[in-house]
């Protein structure tokens, strides 16, 4: 399982209309359930109940996002509709380019995801817990437009592909 | 079968205001982000706005401070509201799903113009 | 703001002719580019999307390539429905911004 080198970027905007960009660092982890490989694009925030929906099957989808799923207490939700795996691969069908799970509040999931798949996503499935995931999490309930890139070496340098 | 419809346009004076209205259907309007791109007939593409599915928000410059875009989930509705209306946002005004981009389904179009 | 300088502006074509249409940056970008179509009286297109990947149910005739800040759109061999407007749009760094447009006519 290795570390997945996570970069955020937000941007802000000034009152002239100018953005500015606000660069965060953080760690998680490479599952098994998907690829060791970088990949970049918007966060967009997903309620574990959102992945459940069927009525999107037939959509041309748009691609190149970063579905964030914060995962409840298994008591939460006794019978989800689909496993973590699961809802991996529905994010991943719908065109997200990378998965990460906050799975601080269900630790179990990482098993889950670590489970040796004989079919892997072809997209990184990340986990990140603690007080990464708390910075994480907190970026994205800031309801600002944000990008993540993930890499599974530290960045060189912090704005290195956010070249703004 | 997805489906965006763009309604609200209309003919205003300058320094007017409006608000555009986009109906979704078809998909679940919670789970994407929208944009706003406008056309001044058999011109070139503008981008004017766009929100993500959890309601962060960026504008082009032209109109910052001005319009402001806004979702109501539970109505499958994406808006736009358009104050101090200029004669140089006469346009034809799309609405688009997609996250960081206007992907493949966008709508017809509703007419703005602002003349005196 | 990033400037987006799309050219030609208008071309003429003959049926089965390779058509080339290029975007250039002002900029470094990466990928972030996307190519439409737009016919008249129409909503705009989604061909290609982060610059090289074609967006499902577009014919394979479309392609995209890039090379540091020089995007290009080809249509290996010019259709009578390829007749239309194209824009680039980059959605690299807001405020995003589309070129001026390429109107493809036919010769």
């Known amino acids: 399982k290795e570390t997945a080198f996570v970069e955020v970027v937000l941007f802000e905007s000034s009152p002239s209309g100018d953005y500015t960009t606000y660069t965060t660092g953080l760690t998680g982890r490479f599952s098994r359930a998907g690829a060791t490989l970088s990949a970049e694009g918007e966060i967009v925030q997903m309620h574990p109940l959102g992945l459940c929906n069927n009525n999107d099957e037939e959509d041309l989808y748009e691609y190149g996002w970063v579905g964030v799923v914060k995962l409840e207490q298994p008591e939460l939700d006794p019978k989800p509709c689909l496993t973590v795996l699961g809802k991996a691969k529905r994010a991943v069908q719908r065109g997200a380019t990378a998965v990460i799970f906050d799975v601080s509040e269900n630790p179990e999931a990482i098993d889950q995801l670590n489970q040796g798949s004989e079919d892997p996503l072809k997209r990184p499935v990340v986990y990140v817990k603690g007080a990464d995931a708390i910075k994480l999490m907190n970026i994205v309930n800031k309801q600002k437009v944000a990008r993540a890139r993930i890499q599974h070496r530290p960045p060189r340098q912090p704005t290195e592909y956010f070249d703004m | 079968e997805v489906q965006l419809v763009e309604s609200g346009g209309g003919l205003v004076q300058p320094g007017e205001s409006l608000k555009l209205s986009c109906s979704a259907s078809?998909?679940?309007?919670?789970?994407?982000?929208m944009h706003w791109i406008r056309q001044v007939p058999g011109k070139g593409l503008d981008w004017v706005a766009y929100?993500?599915?959890?309601?962060?928000?960026l504008y082009a410059a032209a109109v910052k401070g001005r319009f402001t875009i806004s979702r109501d989930n539970a109505k499958n509705t994406l808006y736009l509201e358009l104050t101090s209306l200029k004669p140089e946002d006469t346009a034809i005004y799309h609405c688009?799903?997609?996250?960081?981009?206007?992907?493949?389904?966008w709508g017809r179009g509703t007419l703005v113009t602002v003349s005196s | 703001d990033i400037q987006v300088t799309q050219s030609p502006s208008s071309l003429l074509a003959s049926l089965g002719e390779r058509v080339t249409i290029t975007c250039q940056t002002g900029?470094?970008?990466?990928?972030?580019l996307n190519w439409y179509q737009q016919r008249p009286g129409q909503a705009p297109l989604l061909l290609i999307y982060?610059?090289?990947s074609l967006q499902t149910g577009v014919p394979s005739r479309f392609s995209g390539q890039y090379s540091g800040r020089s995007f290009t759109l080809t249509i290996t061999s010019l259709e009578p429905e390829d007749i239309a407007n194209y824009f680039c749009?980059?959605?690299?760094?807001?405020?995003?911004?589309f070129g001026a447009g390429t109107k493809l006519e036919l010769r």
């Open positions: 688009a799903r997609g996250y960081s981009y206007p992907g493949p389904y």
């Open positions: 078809g998909f679940t309007f919670s789970n994407y982000g």
């Open positions: 929100i993500t599915n959890s309601g962060g928000s």
């Open positions: 900029q470094s970008i990466n990928n972030y």
């Open positions: 982060f610059a090289t």
């Open positions: 749009l980059q959605h690299y760094s807001p405020p995003y911004t």
